[in-house]
């Protein structure tokens, strides 16, 4: 590894009302020449490591979390790895980790609070 991928998420929890959609923001800085084929993006529940959503091998692998998650595919190449969580439920409250691997890797956790 040449150096860790820096992953940025908001410090403050994301607050969402039950039934609304929430965006869990996550970003990284692509190096010059970066291609989506190099990207491994994995969203997981921080504590259990349960898979939530992933993007690997150049394509969106889809939601593994009750089919209520989506990426922003048009923004991925610019380093936007944010996750959209639809129809938020009380049970969704907790910490989500955004894990980004290109040549090296990095991760950061964002908290979701449900009101």
């Amino acid at each position: 590894p040449t150096g860790a991928v820096e992953v940025q998420v908001p410090e403050d929890p994301v607050v969402a009302l039950v039934g609304t959609d929430a965006t869990l923001r996550c970003s990284f800085s692509p190096e010059p020449g970066f291609s989506l084929a190099q990207l491994n993006l994995i969203w997981q529940l921080t504590d259990t490591k349960q898979l939530v959503h992933s993007f690997t091998e150049g394509r969106d692998q889809g939601s593994a979390y009750a089919n209520r998650t989506a990426l922003f595919p048009d923004l991925l190449a610019q380093g936007n790895a944010s996750l959209r969580l639809q129809r938020v439920r009380v049970a969704d409250e907790g910490s989500f980790t955004c894990f980004v691997s290109i040549r090296d890797f990095g991760s950061a956790a964002v908290s979701l609070q449900v009101a």
Epitope: P1, I42, D47, K49, T56, Q61, F105, G106, S107
Partner: antibody
């Protein structure tokens, strides 16, 4: 290139506390990564012990949670492991490693023997 | 916790031969949540494959990974003398992360 190096006593008495430190060089410990301890004993193979994030958040293996503490010292670019109430079953090579999912790189490992 | 079972325990082969190592998980996991490591005597494990099939930096293309669900495979197309070692699989789809017991690839 990030490199890790474990250090600490190679011999600990039964019921005592095992204390190890992992020095991180070639990069900052404050980067977006989790820092882990993994051990390897002949009887149990590779066993994940726990991890810490630069914010101080920790996760521990359920089987060791009651005896383990992992801490981080960002000013010294190092993190540490404490395992208390040790027995002969804790004799192992202890590795530090970087990663939230897979582990890369690893330290070279340090053998800790629990014996009186 | 998820238990990983590797087979065979030992694989005796000659340089130039193909090696096929198996890793079975006690619960189905997404393929992107599995890694493989190589360990030589007196050394730390070295990451070979992550995401079931992506080679880590600097790993020769004779190493390849595949699989999904509960069955995963590490293949070495043509064994080189430096490939004789112990290989471990590891899952990271559930906490705690767990490893297989290892497969030793030895010279026949």
């Amino acid at each position: 290139q990030v490199q890790l190096q474990e250090s600490g006593p190679g011999l600990v008495k039964p019921s005592g506390t095992l204390s190890l430190t992992c020095a991180v060089s070639g990069g900052s410990i404050s980067t977006s990564n989790w820092w882990n301890w993994v051990r390897q004993s002949p009887g149990k193979g590779l066993e994940w012990i726990g991890e810490i994030y630069p914010t101080g958040n920790t996760n521990y293996s359920p089987s060791l949670k009651s005896r383990v503490t992992i801490s981080i010292d960002k000013s010294k670019n190092q993190f540490s492991l404490k395992l208390n109430s040790v027995t002969a079953a804790d004799t192992a090579v202890y590795y530090c490693a970087r990663g939230y999912n897979w582990f890369d790189p690893w330290g070279q490992g340090t053998l800790v023997t629990v014996s009186s | 916790e998820i238990v990983l079972t590797q087979s065979p325990g030992t694989l005796s082969l000659s340089p130039g031969e193909r090696a096929t190592l198996s890793c079975r998980t006690s619960q189905s996991i997404n393929g992107i949540l599995l890694a493989w490591y190589q360990q030589k005597p007196g050394q730390a494990p070295r990451l070979l494959i992550y995401g079931a099939s992506s080679r880590a930096t600097g790993i020769p293309d004779r190493f390849s990974g595949s699989g999904s669900g509960t069955d995963f495979t590490l293949s070495i197309s043509r064994l080189e003398p430096e490939d004789f070692a112990v290989y471990y699989c590891q899952q990271y789809g559930s906490s705690p992360r767990t490893f297989g017991q290892g497969t030793k690839v030895e010279i026949k």
